[in-house]
């Protein structure tokens, strides 16, 4: 707290520039108003104020805001969000994405802070839904943003959203994750011919049934490895021999390097050995 | 409730055959998507898997003792069992059969059954 | 074959205390890891499969974590009933292969 004491002549603040970084901590609490720092918040992060003078002017916007900041000066906190606790920002109200994207450029390279964590929930749960505009921003500042949500709430992401998710974006999601993500990911491309589609399900299908890979066996879409040893294990048990030489085309080769690992090795046990040797690779069921 | 139990001789002779059998009740150790496993645990010390089975008679067993294990299934009793071979003092632990279901984890262990090797 | 390490190897920690255990695994494993909580002269009992799924029956207090080599099991308020012994193990390739264990005691 800094205590209340009376604003020097000639010292009170008519507007937010630089002189005002010579003020003492107790000078900037007596001499610049809480109304005209709100309206003048754009000007603070052009001025190199100290991390101690910054916090006497969040103390002046929690005084005159203590039920929460309004977006105006939310939209141009600029380096000062970066002074606020997840307390502060859960007050907040911020339907705007030009306010998020403002905020979320101050945290720019550094991993998702509390406060940026809790900004993202209260924005995303006042849109009510996870769109793409908004999942377009989120997953550009941080790739990893669809697999850090849980399953419940990746259920509120529409199959339109889907159009933004990069394969990227997908690299740290578990399995329950693309359970949640693949049945949106079919739907949202549902429309597109066989090549096209498998290309963009193609980091989704860790979350895909055994019917679903029986189908895309019989579209000659060369699954890579890579791929394969993403999908589910009890979706790819039920696989016959036959399906998953035409799943992976000329990969098939492969699956003698992945004999001890998961799901290849499950799927090599269920298999009998006769059908095995039909692929000329030395696997021993 | 699927349950396991392990039944064998508590004290073996070196250089002899340890011999294990696991009962499988209230489920089919024909499961199509379970492999039924043999783990060990030496007094005081951690786990260490020896190998599993599939109904189909398809094993896989840790190298570490791959040249002296054999694992076996009856399906008609419901059974599988262990065999090790060749056994020294070293070889003295709980012995757990354990069913590793869809879920690829351990979700059904015997209660254990421990086994000295002296003479 | 890959190597499971967990850290640390004990612990002490009173009742109502947060708990982490970590497993690293020497190459990438997926998500292919499980915890079990083991009490003396008793089976290994499953607590997480899957690094974050809860097995059925197990209190919503263990929570599972990670993916690739690190991962992480968490108590978030330790009941007497939860000390033992805690390993992890990894169910990606054979051989399979198990944490050297975290015994969690009263402090």
């Known amino acids: 707290e800094v205590e209340k004491t009376a604003c020097p002549s000639g010292k009170k603040a008519r507007e937010i520039d630089e002189s005002l970084i010579f003020y003492k901590k107790w000078e900037l609490e007596a001499c610049v108003d809480a109304a005209l720092l709100a309206t003048q918040m754009d000007r603070v992060n052009a001025i190199p104020f100290t991390y101690e003078q910054l916090d006497v002017l969040k103390h002046k916007l929690d005084e005159l805001y203590p039920q929460g900041y309004p977006e105006s000066v939310i939209q141009h906190l600029g380096y000062l969000f970066l002074k606020m606790s997840p307390e502060d920002i859960r007050k907040w109200n911020v339907t705007s994405l030009e306010t998020l994207k403002a905020l979320l450029e101050v945290n720019k390279g550094h991993e998702m802070s509390p406060q940026v964590a809790t900004l993202i929930d209260r924005f995303v749960k006042g849109r009510g839904q996870l769109d793409k505009d908004t999942l377009d921003t989120l997953t550009a500042f941080y790739p990893g943003y669809l697999c850090s949500l849980s399953p419940e709430e990746l259920s509120s992401v529409p199959p339109s959203s889907i159009w933004a998710v990069r394969p990227q974006d997908l690299d740290t999601c578990d399995p329950r994750q693309l359970d949640v993500l693949y049945p949106k990911a079919r739907l949202a491309f549902q429309n597109m011919n066989g090549s096209e589609y498998f290309v963009k399900i193609q980091s989704f299908l860790g979350g895909a049934p055994t019917e679903d890979l029986k189908a895309l066996s019989q579209q000659n879409v060369s699954m890579d490895l890579a791929t394969f040893m993403k999908l589910r294990t009890d979706a790819v048990l039920p696989l016959t021999v036959a399906e998953v030489q035409k799943l992976l085309g000329p990969h098939v080769e492969g699956l003698k390097a992945e004999e001890r690992h998961r799901p290849v090795r499950d799927w090599i046990l269920r298999q009998r050995q006769d059908d095995l040797d039909t692929l000329g690779l030395g696997l021993q069921g | 409730q699927v349950q396991l139990q392990e039944s064998g001789p508590g004290l073996v002779k070196p250089s002899e055959t340890l011999s294990l059998t696991c009962t499988v009740s209230?489920?089919?150790?024909?499961?199509?998507?379970?492999?039924w496993s043999w783990i060990r645990q030496p007094p005081g010390k951690g786990l260490e898997w020896i190998g599993y089975i599939y109904y189909s008679g398809s094993t896989n067993y840790n190298p570490s003792l791959k040249s002296r294990v054999t694992i076996s299934v009856d399906t008609s009793k419901n059974q599988f069992s262990l065999k090790l071979s060749s056994v020294t003092a070293a070889d003295t632990a709980v012995y757990y059969c354990a069913r590793e279901g869809k879920n690829g984890a351990f979700d059904i262990w015997g209660q254990g059954t421990m086994v000295t090797v002296s003479s | 074959d890959i190597q499971m390490t967990q850290s640390p190897s004990s612990l002490s920690a009173s009742v109502g205390d947060r708990v982490t255990i970590t497993c690293r695994a020497s190459?990438?494993?997926?998500?292919?890891l499980n915890w079990y909580q083991q009490k003396p002269g008793k089976a290994p009992k499953l607590l997480i499969y899957?690094?974050?799924s809860l097995q059925s029956g197990v209190p919503s207090r263990f929570s599972g974590s990670g993916s690739g080599t690190d991962f992480t099991l968490t108590i978030s308020s330790l009941q007497p009933e939860d000390f033992a012994t805690y390993y992890c193990?990894?169910?990606?390739?054979?051989?399979?292969?198990f944490g050297g264990g975290t015994k969690v005691e009263i402090k």
């Open positions: 899957a690094a974050s």
């Open positions: 190459q990438s494993i997926s998500s292919y």
């Open positions: 209230g489920g089919s150790v024909s499961s199509f998507t379970d492999t």
């Open positions: 193990q990894q169910s990606y390739s054979t051989p399979l292969t």
